[in-house]
């Protein structure tokens, strides 16, 4: 059927979109983990 | 202190291959977002690709189906390796940790018979 | 891909003048720019974050605003320093065939 041909080869639905992290400091060590702005 | 340092470039003819090491040090790589940035020479930058920390890949168009990104925890180092090459791909490529003042020094590609 | 459209591509100035930067994003990008300075034969430096958060150590004579798909980047007062190559940057991300990272063709601020 359509709908069935339609779940095969249908675009899958994607990970939500993720903005890149930023990480403003100078200098880091890994106990300061940045983050996503406005995530 | 955080560092990052490219190493693998070179002369390549085109339609060779070449992988680009980005060795990291005063983090861990696979804790970060990490991008792939390249400057031709006398140009601008373009983002080619990136990983995300969890080891998600994205890719410019310029560089899909003949890049790839990858990382080696073990060795704290990223990777770009880079197939069918041409001309165009002739730029100095930089590391970047994310968004954020920390670039390796950059290492040159060119790309020329 | 994510286009980036940068405006003027050269710009000549004097020390003193107040400096503006605009960056067009070919889709919405929420407040995910970035602002980068380049002199010759170095790495760029992150000027701003956020469309408008200065990052550590830079003069308060710069200043970022904008959301969606217009940003601004202004230098109140120009000094011997500041000529240099500007460029945006798009941060907002991938997803699927979509590739968010993307930077603007850069202004470079030289000496009238």
């Known amino acids: 059927s359509y709908s069935m041909e339609h779940f095969r080869w249908g675009k899958p639905v994607g990970k939500k979109r993720r903005p890149v992290k930023v990480y403003p400091n100078g200098a880091e060590d890994e106990s300061a983990e940045a983050f996503p702005l406005e995530f | 202190e955080v560092q990052l340092v490219e190493s693998g470039g070179g002369l390549v003819q085109p339609g060779g291959s070449l992988r680009l090491s980005c060795a990291a040090s005063g983090f861990t790589v696979s804790n970060y977002d990490m991008i792939w940035v390249r400057q031709a020479p006398g140009k601008g930058l373009e983002s080619i690709g990136m990983?995300?920390?969890?080891?998600?890949?994205y890719y410019a168009s310029s560089a899909k189906g003949r890049f790839t990104i990858s990382r080696d925890n073990s060795k704290n180092t990223l990777y770009l390796q880079m197939n069918s090459l041409r001309a165009e791909d002739t730029a100095v490529y930089y590391c970047?940790?994310?968004?954020?003042?920390?670039w390796g020094q950059g290492t040159l590609v060119t790309v020329s018979s | 891909d994510i286009q980036m459209t940068q405006s003027p591509s050269t710009l000549s100035a004097s020390v003193g003048d107040r400096v503006t930067i605009t960056c067009q994003a070919s889709q919405s990008i929420s407040s995910y720019l970035a602002w980068y300075q380049q002199k010759p034969g170095k790495a760029p430096k992150l000027l701003i974050y956020s469309a408008s958060t200065l990052a550590s150590g830079v003069p308060s004579r710069f200043s970022g605003s904008g959301s969606g798909t217009e940003f601004t980047l202004t230098i109140s007062s120009l000094q011997p320093d500041d000529f240099a190559t500007y460029y945006c940057?798009?941060?907002?991300?991938?997803?699927?065939?979509?590739?968010?990272?993307?930077f603007g063709g850069g202004t470079k601020v030289e000496i009238k």
């Open positions: 990983i995300y920390d969890d080891g998600d890949t």
């Open positions: 940057q798009s941060y907002d991300g991938s997803s699927g065939s979509s590739y968010g990272v993307g």
């Open positions: 970047v940790k994310g968004v954020s003042n920390h």
